[in-house]
Amino acid sequence: SGTTNTVAAYNLTWKSTNFKTILEWEPKPVNQVYTVQISTKSGDWKSKCFYTTDTECDLTDEIVKDVKQTYLARVFSYPAGNVESTGSAGEPLYENSPEFTPYLETNLGQPTIQSFEQVGTKVNVTVEDERTLVRRNNTFLSLRDVFGKDLIYTLYYWKSSSSGKKTAKTNTNEFLIDVDKGENYCFSVQAVIPSRTVNRKSTDSPVECMGQEKGEFREI
């Protein structure tokens, strides 16, 4: 049911990376506006993005309050210029989103290699600990703060002259690998949450190679 000049939202989709979380939907509004509500399974509904003509709503501020909770959102449709109007059942038209649990479902953002340092035949590769919008005690937590040991990094490394990618993994943000003396290596990292069954991996970091600015070489 609903008024003849509004249509219900559809294709409600969560888009979330490193907990930055946006709800998207269709259709583009024609003579209508939208309001979004979000709640946990046991909580009260909170309204966001009031009477918007957008087809997305940033819900990050709500989900970062507890990233392990499961959230549900709904999108209400109202006639433009007459937001008090309701459907024939006495309520505005709305559509529910799929459930969303940020800790289990947010995509891992592309990591960045912060630095690498060669000392003899060892190379220490450090991954930047990316800041998230999750807060504790008024400070923003890093990805490692949020996921702890659930988060690992995979390092791919290869000789500049070769195509085969050797690998290493760490549950910190640092790798210490053995390399052949006198060889230049390239590096790429990937964030992984092995306990997940979907959205387990990030995209790969940009490739960094020895002999470029980020690295440092020390002969012992």
Epitope: G164, K165, A168, K169, P194, R200
Partner: antibody, heavy 120, light 107 residues
Framework: EVQLVESGGGLVQPGGSLRLSCAAS????????IHWVRQAPGKGLEWVGY????????YYADSVKGRFTISADTSKNTAYLQMNSLRAEDTAVYYC?????????????WGQGTLVTVSS | DIQMTQSPSSLSASVGDRVTITCRAS??????VAWYQQKPGKAPKLLIY???FLYSGVPSRFSGSRSGTDFTLTISSLQPEDFATYYC?????????FGQGTKVEIK
């Protein structure tokens, strides 16, 4: 239910080629890493190589480098092992396996295996 | 490549016995060692990962431990279904490498 099913094994002459398939179900291969491991008759396990289907990265054991190629078709959720210039010592049961962690080689699910016999 | 030296290559034991299989890595592999069980004509099955973690569905009579570069698989009370070949494997660095295997036979 997670399942890996190999196919494509058989009898081939030395110097010949064969392509093995590893069809995955119950999970998406691009979320994992797929390895090939082989076992010669009456012998132990030998790692052959891996592919990360999310980026196409591969690495091979020295014993097969330059002769074997691992690829993946994410639309078919299938990994492949292309074996060229086959030798008698390549005779083995070939298994594909899924990596439980990232790409390190810790295998929680294995296929049933497919036998490759290289003989004239 | 890292070598994994497994011992013994075979052992005979009775149901109810405590069985210990060891593996020594040729260099430091941290806790990156897995143990597998394989029965004739079947694919290997993961028992222990990261040196001491019991894989889902594996009976608690199996356990793994580490002391430096030495790794141990223990079966506290051998059951009839445990007669099989066991392999250790390091996954600390590429390429991952397996031990030679230990065949556990009925005495």
């Amino acid at each position: 239910e997670v399942q890996l099913v190999e196919s494509g094994g058989g009898l081939v002459q030395p110097g010949g080629s064969l392509r093995l398939s590893c069809a995955a179900s119950g999970f998406t291969i691009s979320d994992y890493t797929i390895h090939w491991v082989r076992q010669a008759p009456g012998k132990g396990l030998e790692w052959v190589g891996y592919i990360d289907p999310s980026n196409g990265y591969t690495y091979y054991a020295d014993s097969v480098k330059g002769r074997f190629t691992i690829s993946a078709d994410t639309s078919k959720n299938t990994a492949y092992l292309q074996m060229n210039s086959l030798r008698a010592e390549d005779t083995a049961v070939y298994y594909c396996a899924r990596d439980i962690q990232s790409v390190s080689g810790e295998f929680d699910y294995w296929g049933q295996g497919t036998l490759v016999t290289v003989s004239s | 490549d890292i070598q994994m030296t497994q011992s013994p290559s075979s052992l005979s034991a009775s149901v109810g016995d405590r069985v210990t299989i060891t593996c020594r890595a040729s260099q430091d592999v941290n806790t990156a060692v897995a143990w597998y069980q394989q029965k004739p004509g079947k694919a290997p099955k993961l028992l222990i990962y990261s040196a001491s973690f019991l894989y889902s569905g594996v009976p608690s009579r199996f356990s793994g431990s580490r002391s430096g570069t030495d790794f141990t698989l223990t079966i506290s009370s051998l059951q009839p279904e445990d007669f099989a070949t066991y392999y250790c494997q390091q996954h600390y660095t590429t390429p991952p490498t397996f031990g030679q295997g230990t065949k556990v036979e009925i005495k």
